[in-house]
Interface confidence: low
């Protein structure tokens, strides 16, 4: 029967060439000589000469190694004519399918991938996705199926398995608790992509994971006790600068301090503002103090941040003893 099933040819064949693939055979050859020919891209049109046919025997020949990544399938036509040039068969479809060999390594789409994740997140939180491509076939073979893995992590704090990577999607996730920006602001992961679903060629890239700040450190007064002296009747007078330390990212809402007078200011004599650069609390008099009425005020000031705490943190409190100094006032008649 003048029909041919698809021919499967591995790429990168070593020959020897020409290599016989299959035989075209017409049953009209009884009593008459038949000549065979092929047409189509790869035969008589570009890329010409990849395939040929033995005119008389009908053997289909491969003249050179194939590259699946260049052309994965050839569609040719087989022809059979008699000695006088008359067609004895209709043109026959010949499909040549180039089968894959694992001749390409995976390639990461970037040398360095960058991602970020908030400190303190729970295990399972997704950080970023890395991608490697492989020109080999991933549908019918595992040659182009890439498996991802983490080769190393720097630094190894608090331990060396802070992240995991999904072997097939390349999604990097947090696997352990303990991400702390104040200790490790950035991790460098050496990631690997291995074809043959993990059993083949390997390539590496770097994934840089930036640990973003969360408000997990409370501002702390240092010192916690202050003594100040203020002349009576002075309004807008700077009484004391209160100093706090906060380990969160400087100049961020998680670092910027908010001060509140919690107690000791029944007469609403004092106010406190935050210095925008030093983050200090500047305690000033809102209205004049009266030595004769009260010569000492004990204030209790609490400090928090502009941003809410992400976990329950103890708030720091400072005590300020304000001594009111007597001013010689004109007598009242």
């Amino acid at each position: 029967e003048w029909v041919m099933p698809p021919i499967f040819v591995p790429e990168n064949g070593k020959g020897p060439f020409p290599q016989r693939l299959n035989q075209l055979k017409s049953n009209k050859d009884r009593g008459t000589k038949i000549f065979y020919s092929i047409t189509g891209p790869g035969a008589d049109s570009p890329p010409e000469g990849v395939f040929a046919v033995e005119k008389e025997t009908g053997w289909l020949l491969l003249n050179k190694p194939l590259d699946r990544e260049e052309i994965a399938k050839y569609e040719l036509f087989g022809h059979a004519v008699s000695e006088n040039g008359a067609s004895v068969e209709d043109p026959m479809n010949i499909s040549i399918i180039v089968t894959d060999q694992n001749d390409h390594k995976p390639k990461f789409t970037q040398d360095t991938f960058r991602g970020s994740v908030l400190e303190g997140v729970l295990p399972g939180t997704s950080v970023m996705q890395v991608t490697a491509t492989d020109e080999d076939d991933a549908i019918y073979t595992y040659n182009g199926v890439v498996a991802y893995s983490i080769h190393s992590q720097e630094p190894k704090d608090p331990h060396d398995l802070m992240f995991t990577i999904h072997r097939s999607t390349g999604t990097i996730s947090v696997i352990s608790s303990g991400l702390d920006r104040e200790k490790v602001p950035e991790y460098t992961l050496t990631i690997q992509a291995t074809d043959m679903d993990g059993d083949g060629s390997t390539t590496t890239a770097v994934a840089v994971v930036e640990i973003l700040d969360a408000n997990d450190n409370a501002p702390m007064f240092d010192p916690q006790k202050y003594e100040a002296h203020v002349p009576e009747n002075a309004v807008g007078h700077e009484v004391q600068r209160l100093t706090v330390t906060d380990l969160d990212a400087p100049n961020s809402p998680a670092w910027r301090a908010t001060y509140l007078i919690m107690g000791g200011d029944d007469g609403d004599h004092f106010t406190i503002t935050t210095h925008p650069e030093s983050n200090q609390g500047i305690l000033t008099t809102r209205k004049g103090l009266d030595f004769e009425a009260k010569n000492q005020h004990t204030l209790y000031v609490e400090v928090t941040n502009e941003a809410p705490f992400v976990l329950k943190l103890p708030t720091s409190t400072a005590t300020i003893v304000v001594h009111v100094e007597d001013v010689n006032e004109a007598p009242v008649f």
Partner: antibody, heavy 121, light 107 residues
Framework: VQLVEQSGAELVKPGASVKISCKAS????????MNWVKQRPGKGLEWIGR????????KYNGKFKGKATLTADKSSSTAYMQLSTLTSEDSAVYFC??????????????WGQGTSVTVSS | ELQMTQSPASLSASVGETVTITCRLS??????LAWYRQKEGESPQLLVY???TLAEGVPSRFSGSGSGTQFSLKINSLQPEDFGNYYC?????????FGAGTKLEIK
């Protein structure tokens, strides 16, 4: 390879303005701060300000507010600094320098080669 | 504004010697201090950040230390390429400020 390439030397007249550029390559331009630093001949380094190309946020040294204007073009990975109403005090070499984000935690790790600005009539 | 005092202003030393440059600040900047070297006609090069972390490609003969308001940069076994101007820089709060510099010369 991370590179920061600056525009060439400028000779400008007093009272004029000048705009110098800094083209970045080899890193994520949009997500790193670009700083500008002034150096007068034979003198030390003076921080002018910085810009975050991702959203255009700027921070200036108070001393240079009104003098320097920082901009960035993400499509060309280029940062710009315009200096206005130039005087002889503005004659200096101006450097751009990358600083990785987050907050102010990182130092300036990649520097341009510097652009010399000479103010003279 | 934060004041930075870098000392000495200049220093003469021979190849193979060990030198130390110090930087004192008027306010606590924790560990956020960087050191740069600038050779004549070149741009500054980051040597150390976060007080003691060596930048990529910087030889181990350089070491940084200190925190708060007092910092130092130590260079062991000076090499010819180490000569130039050294600057400390606050990378903690605005404005980022640089020390006045230390000129390290060959004796």
């Amino acid at each position: 390879v991370q590179l920061v390439e600056q525009s060439g030397a400028e000779l400008v007249k007093p009272g004029a303005s000048v705009k110098i550029s800094c083209k970045a390559s080899g890193y994520a331009f949009s997500s790193s701060w670009m700083n500008w630093v002034k150096q007068r001949p034979g003198k030390g380094l003076e921080w002018i300000g910085r810009i975050y190309p991702g959203d255009g946020e700027t921070k200036y040294n108070g001393k240079f507010k009104g003098k320097a204007t920082l901009t960035a073009d993400k499509s060309s990975s280029t940062a710009y600094m315009q200096l206005s109403t130039l005087t002889s005090e503005d004659s200096a070499v101006y450097f751009c320098a990358r600083q990785r984000d987050y907050g102010a935690l990182y130092a300036m790790d990649y520097w341009g080669q510097g652009t010399s600005v000479t103010v003279s009539s | 504004e934060l004041q930075m005092t870098q000392s000495p202003a200049s220093l003469s030393a021979s190849v193979g010697e060990t030198v130390t440059i110090t930087c004192r600040l008027s306010e606590n900047i924790y560990s956020y201090l960087a050191w740069y070297r600038q050779k004549e006609g070149e741009s500054p090069q980051l040597l150390v950040y976060n007080s003691k972390t060596l930048a990529e490609g910087v030889p181990s003969r350089f070491s940084g230390s200190g925190s708060g308001t007092q910092f130092s940069l130590k260079i062991n076994s000076l090499q010819p390429e180490d000569f130039g101007n050294y600057y400390c820089q606050n990378h903690y709060g605005f404005p980022f400020t640089f020390g006045a510099g230390t000129k390290l010369e060959i004796k």
